[in-house]
Amino acid sequence: LSEEADDTDSELGSMKPLHTFCAMKADDGPCKAMIRSYFFNMYTHQCEEFIYGGCEGNENRFDTLEECKKTCIPGYEKTAVKAASGAERPDFCFLEEDPGLCRGYMKRYLYNNQTKQCERFVYGGCLGNRNNFETLDECKKICENPVHSPSPVNEVQMSDYVTDGNTVTDRSTVNNIVVPQSPKVPRRRDYRGRPWCLQPADSGLCKASERRFYYNSATGKCHRFNYTGCGGNNNNFTTRRRCLRSCKTGLIKNKSKGVVK
C-alpha cells in the first residue's frame, strides 16, 4: 500500500498579479519631476505610493490608487463592494506548518488555526510556505490580532495590519494605513512634507543587501541603511539626493522636538 502525501501546496492563486507588468518594480525614471503615482508591490500584494520622475519608467505606474487596485489586484472590485466587517486574516495564516525542503533548523513562528495563536516551529531554511514569520510579534500582528485600518472597504492586505504594541506613543494615519509613530520622531504637526518621511527606516523582509537612504525627521538628514530587497516602507531612497529632495522640504526646523539617541 502506498502512503498518500497530504496536499499542502500553497500556490496562492489569489496572490498572483493580473498582468505581468504588475510584477515590475516601481521605476521612478531618470527625470527630476516629483509626481505622486502608485504601483503594485508584488511582495506586499498591495498598491503603494511612489514618486515618479516624469519620464520613462515602466507600465507599473498609475495616477490613482483605485486604478492601480483595479488593474493589479485580483478580485479587487468584488472585494471593494463588501461592507467593512472588521479585520480579516490573510489566507496564508491558515496554511499548515511546513518546515520546507531544507534542514537548517531556524527558529520561526506560525499561526496555528486550531489554537488561534502564533507558535514557534522549526523551519528548515528553504521552500516552506508563507505562514512563516521571523518574530512572534510579526506573526501576531498579521495573523493573531490584525488591526484593521480605518478604510471604507475591507481589503485583506499586508499593510492593513500593524503592531498593537505598548511602546507606541503616537499613531497617525498615512494613506489609510495606521502607522505607529516612534517617540523619537517629531509629531505630524511639526512636519509639513510627505507622510512617509516620518516612518522609521525599515529593512524589509527579503534576502538582499542593498544600500539605501532614509530620511530622519529628527535630524533633518538622510542616512544610509541596509535594505533587504522587498517590503519595508516608502522612506527608502536609492540616493541621498533623492531622499533629501523628497523629504527635506517638509521639516519646520524650529518646531522639531526629535532627539537622536
Epitope: 502512503e3 498518500e4 502525501a5 497530504d6 496536499d7 499542502t8 501546496d9 500556490e11 511546513d98 518546515p99 525542503l101 531544507c102 534542514r103 537548517g104 528548515g124 531554511g125 528553504c126 521552500l127 527579503c206 534576502k207 538582499a208 543587501s209 533587504t228 530587497g229 522587498c230
Partner: antibody
Framework: QVQLQQSGPGLVKPSQTLSLTCAIS??????????WSWIRQSPGRGLEWLGI?????????RYAVSVKSRITINPDTSKNQFSLQLNSVTPEDTAVYYC?????????????WGQGTLVTVSS | DIVMTQSPLSLPVTPGEPASISCRSS???????????LNWYLQKPGQSPQLLIY???NRASGVPDRFSGSGSGTDFTLKISRVEAEDVGVYYC?????????FGQGTKVEIK
C-alpha cells in the same frame, strides 16, 4: 551511494495517464534529510520541475502550477520508491522524465538523478 | 515565478583556457545570512544532469576545483579556470528561493 532506477512505459496515448516509478537504493523515501522530485526535459521547455514530496513529521508535497490539476506524486514506503502520475496527457507532455533526490541536509540541491525515461505521447 | 536567464546560450571553448557562464535571476536569491539559493548543474551528452555547485559557491563532492561559483543578489557566475575536454555539455543554473523551482535555459559548452 544513492541510486535511482526509473521504470515505466515510453509511449502513452493522448488523454491517458502517464505513470512512472522511481526505485531508491542507498536511502529511504521516508528519510527526513531528503526530498523526492520529478523533473522533465524537452527541447521546447528545457528542464521543468514538476513536483516534490518529502517526509518530516508527516508527508508534504508541492506541485508546479502548470501541471497541478493533473499530477500526483506518491511515496511507497513498503517498496522504497515513489511514483509520478500525470493525467490527461497531450503531445505537449512528450519529454524525458527524471526522478531526482533533493539533499535537504548539506547541499540543498538535486544531488542524485535517475537515468531518465523518454515518454512520447502519441496515438 | 522566478525567471532564470543564462548567457551565453552557446560557448565554444579552447582546452586549457578559462570559461565563464552568467546566470541572472528575476529576484534576489541571497538570504540575509549570506546563503545563496542557487545551484549549478552539468548535463554531459547522453547523461542525466549532475550537481556541480550548491548554495552558489560550494563544490559538490567529486567536482574538480577548476569549477567555481560566485555572485550575489541576482547576478551569478560559474567559472571554469582551465577547460578540459570532459567539461563539454550543457550547464544549468537553478533557484530554490521559492516555488516553483526553476532552471535557466542552459549554456552549451563545446570545444572549438
Amino acid at each position: 551511494q544513492v541510486q535511482l532506477q526509473q521504470s515505466g512505459p515510453g509511449l502513452v496515448k493522448p488523454s491517458q495517464t502517464l505513470s512512472l516509478t522511481c526505485a531508491i537504493s542507498g536511502d529511504s523515501v521516508s528519510s527526513d534529510s531528503a526530498a523526492w522530485s520529478w523533473i522533465r526535459q524537452s527541447p521546447g521547455r528545457g528542464l521543468e520541475w514538476l513536483g516534490i514530496i518529502y517526509k518530516r513529521s508527516k508527508w508534504y508535497n508541492r506541485y508546479a502550477v502548470s501541471v497541478k490539476s493533473r499530477i500526483t506524486i506518491n511515496p511507497d514506503t513498503s517498496k522504497n520508491q515513489f511514483s509520478l502520475q500525470l493525467n490527461s496527457v497531450t503531445p505537449e507532455d512528450t519529454a524525458v522524465y527524471y526522478c531526482a533526490r533533493w539533499d535537504s541536509d548539506k547541499m540543498w540541491g538535486f544531488d542524485d538523478w535517475g537515468q531518465g525515461t523518454l515518454v512520447t505521447v502519441s496515438s | 515565478d522566478i525567471v532564470m536567464t543564462q548567457s551565453p546560450l552557446s560557448l565554444p571553448v579552447t582546452p586549457g583556457e578559462p570559461a565563464s557562464i552568467s546566470c541572472r535571476s528575476s529576484q534576489s536569491l541571497v538570504f540575509r545570512d549570506g546563503t545563496t539559493y542557487l545551484n549549478w548543474y552539468l548535463q554531459k551528452p547522453g547523461q542525466s544532469p549532475q550537481l556541480l555547485i550548491y548554495k552558489g559557491s560550494n563544490r559538490a563532492s567529486g567536482v574538480p576545483d577548476r569549477f567555481s561559483g560566485s555572485g550575489s543578489g541576482t547576478d551569478f557566475t560559474l567559472k571554469i579556470s582551465r577547460v578540459e575536454a570532459e567539461d563539454v555539455g550543457v550547464y544549468y543554473c537553478q533557484q530554490y528561493d521559492s516555488y516553483p523551482l526553476t532552471f535557466g535555459q542552459g549554456t552549451k559548452v563545446e570545444i572549438k
